[in-house]
């Protein structure tokens, strides 16, 4: 659950985030699991720890292995594992499956290919894009921030897309590449204003103090592939990750599902070891897409333990 796969190519930069998160003020220690040897924090090292991030600048095949991160606060320690694999660069153009990030789909009207993991790096535009190793040229291709937009998508646009950028660390530049497949869906879909299925508006969810609780934000957005659709949680009207309560975590990915042919997204909020103060918070489920934003709210109430008499 708190283990994450990461991969990279030799002689490229690789930055890995600890799967366990906490306040920025919490210290994070990194270890190489096989030897239990501490990873240094001094930036002069090729491999060093920088808070929640583990940096390989650049990576070497020998760096492969499992790394342990321990988030330390005054009251608790939390452990996560990063399973890192560094591969040799391929001489030919084919990108093997094990180097591929998740596949994305596009349609004639909407096509966005995000550059995977780029948010972890200190990069500056322009981002370079390649399809099957060929640099993309022409007015149909637009590199915008961390994604590529393809105008008037055709079935021939399907393929493997690689983004290439430069990570800067203290004046030194390191190359990074990441590849994902793009598929083209030829379907007559449509998009609707988000419809939130869960939680119900003003829902009150019963929880037990000391136990774990899950809240699901679920919304549907139309039929077929949806673009710029998202569901997310807010805590007291602010971003979950910045609220500063590591017991309350939003799942990393959004689960896509289909309900009566409609495209829906779910986002789970996990509350570990529910405390009294959690009952005072407001949990907002936000669903948004090109049409607009909609919000539902849920509060927690204490579940009264039922006496079981024989």
């Amino acid at each position: 659950k708190f283990s994450k796969q990461s991969w990279g190519l030799e002689n490229e930069a690789l930055i890995v985030r600890c799967p366990r998160q906490g306040k920025p003020s919490y210290t994070v220690d990194w270890y190489y699991s096989q030897t239990n040897k501490s990873i240094p924090t001094q930036e002069r090292n090729r491999v060093f720890a920088s808070g929640q991030l583990l940096k390989f600048l650049p990576a070497a095949v020998a760096d492969s292995g499992i790394y342990t991160c321990i988030v330390r606060s005054p009251t608790f320690n939390r452990t996560g594992y990063a399973n890192v694999t560094i591969y040799k660069k391929q001489s030919d153009c084919n990108v093997p499956d094990y180097l591929m990030y998740s596949t994305v789909s596009g349609s004639e009207k909407n096509s966005k290919i995000y550059c995977p993991t780029i948010d972890l790096y200190n990069w500056t535009a322009p981002l370079e894009w390649f399809k099957n190793c060929q640099a993309l040229q022409g007015s149909r291709y637009r590199a915008h921030k961390s994604f590529l937009v393809i105008d008037n998508v055709m079935t021939e646009d399907a393929g493997d897309y690689t983004c290439k950028f430069i990570h800067n660390e203290n004046g030194a530049n390191y190359s990074v590449t990441a590849t994902r497949s793009f598929t083209v869906k030829d379907e007559q879909g449509f998009s609707l204003f988000p419809v939130i299925g869960a939680p119900a508006q003003n829902e009150i969810k019963e929880v037990e103090i000391g136990k774990n609780a899950n809240l699901t934000c679920s919304a549907c957005f139309g039929k077929g592939t949806q673009f710029l659709a998202a569901v997310l949680w807010q805590l007291n009207g602010t971003k979950i990750t910045d609220f500063g309560e590591p017991r309350i975590q939003q799942e990393e990915g959004q689960n896509q599902s289909f309900s009566n042919g409609l495209a829906c997204l779910d986002m789970v909020l996990r509350i570990a070891d529910v405390k009294e103060e959690d009952l005072l918070l407001q949990y907002d489920c936000l669903a948004l897409n090109l049409h607009g934003l909609r919000r539902h709210t849920v509060r927690l109430s204490r579940k009264n333990p039922i006496d079981h008499h024989s």
């Epitope: 508006q201 998202a230 009207g237 948004l288 909609r294 709210t297």
Partner: antibody, heavy 116, light 107 residues
């Protein structure tokens, strides 16, 4: 203390452009959605636009869609409103505001006058 | 889009009076409703959020009620500093919309 300070207002001719800025301080700017709201002289409040924490999601009132662009620079704790193709009916005091499921803090506003 | 209506559009009252302002949404908005007070030349000030919750620092004579489509702002005993214009706003769904306002002035 939460502070929002708008600037960039002034007199502009119809069809012209103006860029408003809002400097935020006293809170974690990048953790909040942010709004622009306007008020024409002697009239009520009109919501203009909202932007998500990282700027990836933006929504507009129909009256400004296609003409106004909301943006933000989290490294500078600043919110922007780029206003193009301005019309006389855009004359108003423009407020920048913080979202917490409602608007809980407002700036003092900056006056935009569109007139020939 | 969700339309917000307020009534009355204006009212005259005396210090000590109980004042009630209503706000109606054209469709259900749950409790995503806020009330603001605005005085001439000033920015609006948040009074009530989530339909019923008093914003920190706001006097307890202000209260909010309702959910769904019908909402009420009540001032239990009007004070001289309460003469102002009051707006409701829904934040359930974009475009977020304000009511046209209710002006409370001295009788």
């Amino acid at each position: 203390e939460v502070q929002l300070l708008e600037s960039g207002g002034g007199l502009v001719q119809p069809g012209g452009s103006l860029r408003l800025s809002c400097a935020a301080s006293g809170f974690a700017f990048s953790s909040h959605w942010m709004h622009w709201v306007r008020q024409a002289p002697g009239k009520g409040l009109e919501w203009v636009a909202v932007i998500s924490y990282d700027g990836s999601n933006k929504y507009y009132a129909d009256s400004v869609k296609g003409r106004f662009t909301i943006s933000r620079d989290n490294s500078k704790n600043t919110l922007y409103l780029q206003m193009n193709s301005l019309r006389a009916e855009d004359t108003a005091v423009y407020y920048c505001a913080r979202d917490r499921g409602m608007i809980d803090y407002w700036g003092q506003g900056t006056l935009v006058t569109v007139s020939s | 889009d969700i339309q917000m209506t307020q009534s009355p559009s204006s009212l005259s009252a005396s210090v000590g009076d109980r004042v009630t302002i209503t706000c109606r949404a054209s469709q259900g908005i749950g409790s995503w409703l806020a009330w603001y007070q605005q005085k001439p030349g000033k920015a609006p000030k948040l009074l009530i959020h989530a339909a019923t919750k008093l914003q920190t620092g706001v006097p307890s004579r202000f209260s909010g009620s309702g959910s769904g489509t019908d909402f009420t702002l009540t001032i239990s005993s009007l004070q001289p500093e309460d003469f102002a214009t009051y707006y409701c706003q829904q934040s359930y769904s974009t475009p977020f919309t304000f009511g046209p306002g209710t002006k409370v002035d001295i009788k």
